[in-house]
Every structure is written in structure tokens, then in C-alpha cells.
């Protein structure tokens, strides 16, 4: 049994780190493999993660952690029974992928404006809470040529779009993702998308 692609891990900087790797052949990850992890810290214990399959030769493991701080460093050992397949380390603060924003809602009852709101995925006491900026993707199912990214570089998780910039009488979808500038993170996954119908019509005199 051999590791084809070494484990690569990202942290949500809250309670979960996700490690993914590829094996040299088809593997029943949960039956054959264990990923052991231990914080380099006084009197810390070794913890075990049971991986899941992620495609035919891919495995993924979700490591449960405490809150993350910048000093944290983990040793990782990938075992197949009594055989050590791979040994490495992981510093969560240097490999952060934020959680996806949630509760994306579209408010169309505001005159002339489409208001999008969503929730910050972190509690106020988390370091990432005040560091997230967002990208909102809006596209149309009726007009495949229409797709826009709106960068939200302020802290408030809202975006206002003049309804007049969207075509009337067609449906749009929106999704949002986040990243944290000062932690040099990757982008989060996209939130689930939300659909709405743009019924706004310009006043007659403006037509």
C-alpha cells in the first residue's frame, strides 16, 4: 500500500481541519487507514481520525480540533494497520480555508434595489470574524452570458444592487464566498445559491 499524493490539509480556523490525499490504488479508506494527529504541546495526547473515501483512490479526513491559535503545530501520521505510510506536520494558521458564509437572503421589497444579506460563518470571538471579505457571484439561468462577481471589501455582510442593472422579468441566482486577507487564506467554498425573480420595471418616463 502506497501514498500517491501526500496529505494536504486546510483549517477552518475554528474546530475542523480537513486533510485530503490519494492512494496508489483503490482503497477502502475507513477500513484500511487511520490518520493520527497530535498537537505539539505539553502533555497532549494522540487523536485518531477515520478517513472517508473521496473518489476511487482519494481519502479525506476531518480532524476535530480545539480553537486554533497561531502557535499550534500538529504532527500527522498516516497508518495502514501497523505500517506507517507517511509522516508530516501541519500548522493550521498557515493553511486556512474559511467556512462558507450562510443564510444568503435576497430582499426585493426595497425600492429600486436588490439587497443581498448573508451571515458571517464565525462567532464574534473568532479571529477571522472581523477579517472576512466576500465575493458575491450573480448569474442568470435565462441569460447564460450574464455572470458577475461583486467584491465586498467592507465588513458588513450585505450587497446592494440597483434593480435597474438587472434585466426585468427573468430569474437570477446568487452565491457568496469569503476569504481573510490578514491570514492569507484561500477562498471558502461557495454558499448554497439563492434564486429570485427580478420583477422590477423602470418608471414609464425613464423608458
Amino acid at each position: 500500500m502506497k501514498v500517491l499524493q501526500e496529505p494536504a490539509c486546510v483549517s477552518d480556523y475554528m474546530s475542523i481541519s480537513t486533510c485530503e490525499w490519494k492512494m496508489g490504488g483503490p482503497t477502502n479508506c475507513s477500513a484500511e487507514l487511520r490518520l493520527l494527529y497530535q498537537l505539539v504541546f505539553q502533555s497532549s495526547e494522540t487523536h485518531t481520525c477515520v478517513p472517508e473515501n473521496n473518489g476511487g483512490v482519494g481519502c479525506v479526513c476531518h480532524l476535530l480540533m480545539d480553537d486554533v491559535v497561531s502557535m499550534d503545530n500538529y504532527t500527522l501520521d498516516l497508518w495502514a494497520g501497523q505500517q506507517l505510510l507517511w509522516k508530516g506536520s501541519f500548522k493550521p494558521s498557515e493553511h486556512v480555508k474559511p467556512r462558507a458564509p450562510g443564510n444568503l437572503t435576497v430582499h426585493t421589497n426595497v425600492s429600486d434595489t436588490v439587497l443581498l444579506t448573508w451571515s458571517n460563518p464565525y462567532p464574534p470571538d473568532n479571529y477571522l470574524y472581523n477579517d472576512l471579505t466576500y465575493a458575491v457571484n450573480i448569474w442568470s439561468e435565462n441569460d447564460p452570458a450574464y455572470s458577475r462577481i461583486h467584491n465586498v471589501t467592507y465588513l458588513k455582510p450585505t450587497l446592494r444592487i440597483p434593480a435597474s442593472t438587472l434585466k426585468s422579468g427573468i430569474s437570477y441566482r446568487a452565491r457568496v464566498r469569503a476569504w481573510a486577507q490578514h491570514y492569507n487564506t484561500t477562498w471558502s467554498e461557495w454558499s448554497p445559491s439563492t434564486k429570485w425573480y427580478n420583477s422590477y420595471r423602470e418608471p414609464f418616463e425613464q423608458r
Partner: antibody
Framework: EVQLVESGGGLEQPGGSLRLSCAGS????????MTWVRQAPGKGLEWVSS????????YYADSVKGRFTISRDNSKNTLYLQMNSLRAEDTAVYYC??????????????????WGQGTTVTVSS | DIVMTQSPLSLPVTPGEPASISCTSS???????????VDWYLQKSGQSPQLLIY???KRASGVPDRFSGSGSGTDFTLKISRVEAEDVGFYYC?????????FGQGTKLEIK
């Protein structure tokens, strides 16, 4: 009541052996790391050894490494210190102390918040 | 190994007056914001040590609020706002960030 009670001290000749015990009660013993600290007559406190809650990880002062062995029996809520090749400079009162909560991924530290009454070890010919 | 240096080594105090003991470590004991791995212990004559302060500034259960800990990184202080007769004994700082745990030399607090 959270309590630690040491035993096993006594008079031993240089080169001899002693086994100290520390019985814990009033807390979930296996969840906590444990520590031994000693105090030579008229001197300050000196850390001797520590062990994680599971017993998988042990730590020793250079002065006792290779001679002392820390262990625990969580089924008996008891901590041990096996002392071999004893020297005159090992003469001290030995205390056990409750250390950090080590079942969490990052052990939670609340100080060495409970200490035993101490057991005296005298090494002399 | 980390070295812990305590001062003064002797501290005569008048009851009701404040007292202050300093402890300096040879390397930072700050693991993360608010988590300085330094403790303060009091050992009264003929007794086992007792915990006063842990993680730099957190008062242990049952410890009177006249005791307080402060500092960060390498410099730490134990303050007693108003010394009482029962406070006499040896005070020790200890680094608990990593083994070997290291105690300061001890400060003998006595009543004038």
C-alpha cells in the same frame, strides 16, 4: 473532595530503589496529566517528572532521566514513581500534583491545582 | 531549558501594606493571546505548595482577591494588595509552557 495521597517514602541506601505511589480521588483521574515535584531539605521546588492522562507520554528532568520511571494505573486512580539507582542528592520530600486536562486536543491548563501532602525519601548509607 | 529568575529573594512587609514579587523568564511564555504559561505558588511552613495564580493572571479557586498576577511574555509580577499575617511563606513562580517545568528560586515573605 479532590485529594492526592502519597506513600512509599522511606530510608534507602545509595544505589537502592523505592517506589512512590500517589492515590487520586474526587476527580476523573484518567483525564488529567500528573506531575511529581520534589524539595530537598532547606531548598526550593524542583520538577521531577510528568505523565499525560493516558500514560502514553512521559517527561523527565535531566537529573533523574534513566533512573526514575513515571507510570500510572488509571483503573486504580494511582500514579507511581519508580526510583532506581538512588543517590544522596535524591533526598527530598516528593509531592504529586494534578496537572492539565489532557483529553482535549489542546490540553487545558488550570495550574498544578491539587498537591499531595508529600512523602519523604532519604538516601543515606 | 527555560530559566526563571525571581526577585527579591527576601521580602519583609508590614501588615496592611502591599507587596510585589517579580519573575523573569529566559524566553517568552506566551503561547497565544491571554495565555502566558506562568504560575505562582505559596508554600507555608511545613505545608505542601498551594496554587495562587495560573496562566499569568488567573486566580485559583479559593484564593483571596488581594492576590493578583500580571505580565506577559517574559516579565511577570505577583502583587498582594494588603499583606496579612497568614501570607507568610515562600512564593515561587513556575513556567508550565513545556517540560522541564522550572521554578524560580523562591521569595521569602515575612512580617516586619
Amino acid at each position: 473532595e479532590v485529594q492526592l495521597v502519597e506513600s512509599g517514602g522511606g530510608l534507602e541506601q545509595p544505589g537502592g530503589s523505592l517506589r512512590l505511589s500517589c492515590a487520586g480521588s474526587g476527580f476523573t483521574f484518567r483525564d488529567f496529566a500528573m506531575t511529581w515535584v520534589r524539595q530537598a531539605p532547606g531548598k526550593g521546588l524542583e520538577w521531577v517528572s510528568s505523565i499525560s492522562g493516558s500514560g502514553d507520554n512521559t517527561y523527565y528532568a535531566d537529573s533523574v532521566k534513566g533512573r526514575f520511571t513515571i507510570s500510572r494505573d488509571n483503573s486504580k486512580n494511582t500514579l507511581y514513581l519508580q526510583m532506581n539507582s538512588l543517590r544522596a542528592e535524591d533526598t527530598a520530600v516528593y509531592y504529586c500534583a494534578k496537572d492539565r486536562l489532557s483529553i482535549t486536543v489542546r490540553p487545558r491548563y488550570y495550574g498544578l491545582d491539587v498537591w499531595g501532602q508529600g512523602t519523604t525519601v532519604t538516601v543515606s548509607s | 531549558d527555560i530559566v526563571m529568575t525571581q526577585s527579591p529573594l527576601s521580602l519583609p512587609v508590614t501588615p496592611g501594606e502591599p507587596a510585589s514579587i517579580s519573575c523573569t523568564s529566559s524566553q517568552s511564555l506566551l503561547y497565544s493571546i491571554g495565555y502566558n504559561y506562568v504560575d505562582w505558588y505559596l508554600q507555608k511552613s511545613g505545608q505542601s505548595p498551594q496554587l495562587l495564580i495560573y496562566l499569568g493572571n488567573k486566580r485559583a479557586s479559593g484564593v483571596p482577591d488581594r492576590f493578583s498576577g500580571s505580565g506577559s511574555g517574559t516579565d511577570f509580577t505577583l502583587k498582594i494588595s494588603r499583606v496579612e499575617a497568614e501570607d507568610v511563606g515562600f512564593y515561587y513562580c513556575m513556567q508550565s509552557l513545556q517540560t522541564p517545568y522550572v521554578f524560580g528560586q523562591g521569595t521569602k515573605l515575612e512580617i516586619k
